[in-house]
Interface confidence: low
């Protein structure tokens, strides 16, 4: 069973709290922190020993419209001699952000928040060796 | 994508862009997802350049729960499981949008928030400055 | 499969003191924060109160603080509330329940137990 909203989770509802409809939130979505940078060590999707590379898709009726997703280069790890080493695995790291979706049915527009999966990088990992009997 | 003609006989209310605020469906599309990383898979453990996960908690914004990597050393382990220090474990970053109540306190009232989070690390090649 | 199984409710005169119970399974109970939400006759629902995983930190509403008290046992995948000076507008039906807060929607809920309080 679902429960239906609660008047407030942690604490009582200030009186000033904007009117929502039921079944829906109202989401400002000029974004807070909006100019912050990502300040990562240069240019590490070439230097590490699991690289990668980066894939930009574009959806005009999705908010951010832009989503960057990276891919490994390789199966295997990058070693010291710069050769592909197939005893280890280059493997993707992954994060979940939100985002906000924009739906047209007819002449009206509904919104839909929804969760992305965005690969970020790749790492080095020691493979798991399942041994057969 | 793809985008949606709009019919042309539809009132011209709405901008090509999004509208600063709008009202948004309740039910977050995908929302069941596995978001503990720990559960997800053990790379962090299995990393050539390990980290910790540290959990970061606010009421106040969505996801409620969000785990931030640290990397475990700042050289990278060997074959022979020892830190080599002539390669550096370093964190990878990422901008993620979070929702934050908006004022705060209310039950269905958010703002976007960006936020940037270490997801994990890698291994790289360090950068040499040479001293002339 | 998700349980909760609430349990404690009863008649209890204005004053006097009671305590709820909530038994917890078919999930990993002390990895989540948990929650008592009411429903007077007639109303909506009113969250009560919140204890995080471990334990540690308790949140209420301001019209239980002082009287109500919120603890889990995660050996026991238990989760109490201990109510104090009751008033008859405490009279409800408690519920415990488990699950993220956005939009205020809880995971999964029990069949509630009933508190009366009259004289």
């Known amino acids: 069973r679902k429960i239906p909203k609660v008047g407030h989770t942690f604490f009582q509802k200030p009186e000033s709290c904007p009117p929502v409809p039921g079944g829906s939130m109202k989401l400002d979505i000029g974004i807070i922190n909006e100019n912050q940078r990502v300040s990562m060590s240069r240019n590490i999707e070439s230097r590490s020993t699991s690289p990668w590379n980066y894939t930009v898709t574009w959806d005009p009726n999705r908010y951010p419209s832009e989503v960057v997703q990276a891919q490994c280069r390789n199966l295997g790890c990058i070693n010291a001699q710069g050769k592909e080493d197939i005893s280890m695995n280059s493997v993707p790291i992954q994060q979940e952000t939100l985002v906000v979706r924009r739906k047209h049915q007819g002449c009206s527009v509904s919104f839909q928040l929804e969760k992305v999966l965005v690969t970020v990088g790749c790492t080095c990992v020691t493979p798991v060796i399942h041994h057969v009997q | 994508g793809i985008t949606i003609p709009r019919n042309p006989g539809c009132p011209n209310s709405e901008d090509k862009n999004f509208p600063r605020t709008v009202m948004v469906n309740l039910n977050i599309h995908n929302r069941n997802t596995n978001t503990n990383p720990k559960r997800s898979s053990d790379y962090y453990n299995r990393s050539t350049s390990p980290w910790n996960l540290h959990r970061n908690e606010d009421p106040e914004r969505y996801p409620s729960v969000i785990w931030e990597a640290k990397c475990r050393h700042l050289g990278c382990i060997n074959a022979d499981g020892n830190v080599d220090y002539h390669m550096n474990s370093v964190p990878i970053q990422q901008e993620i949008l979070v929702l934050r109540r908006e004022p705060p306190h209310c039950p269905n009232s958010f703002r976007l928030e960006k936020i940037l989070v270490s997801v994990g690390c890698t291994c790289v090649t360090p950068i040499v400055h040479h001293v002339a | 499969e998700v349980q909760l199984v609430e349990s404690g409710g009863g008649l209890v005169q204005p004053g006097g003191s009671l305590r709820l119970s909530c038994a917890a399974s078919?999930?990993?109970?002390?990895?989540?924060?948990m929650y008592w939400v009411r429903q007077a006759p007639g109303k909506g629902l009113e969250w009560v109160a919140e204890i995080r995983q471990d334990g540690s930190e308790q949140y209420y509403v301001d019209s239980v603080k002082g009287r109500f008290t919120i603890s889990r046992d995660n050996a026991k995948n238990s989760l109490y509330l201990q109510m104090n000076s009751l008033r008859a507008e405490d009279t409800a039906v408690y519920y415990c329940?488990?699950?993220?807060?956005?939009?205020?929607?809880?995971?999964?809920w029990g069949q509630g137990t009933l508190v009366t309080v009259s004289s």
């Open positions: 329940a488990k699950g993220e807060i956005l939009p205020l929607y809880f995971d999964y």
């Open positions: 078919g999930f990993t109970f002390s990895s989540y924060s």
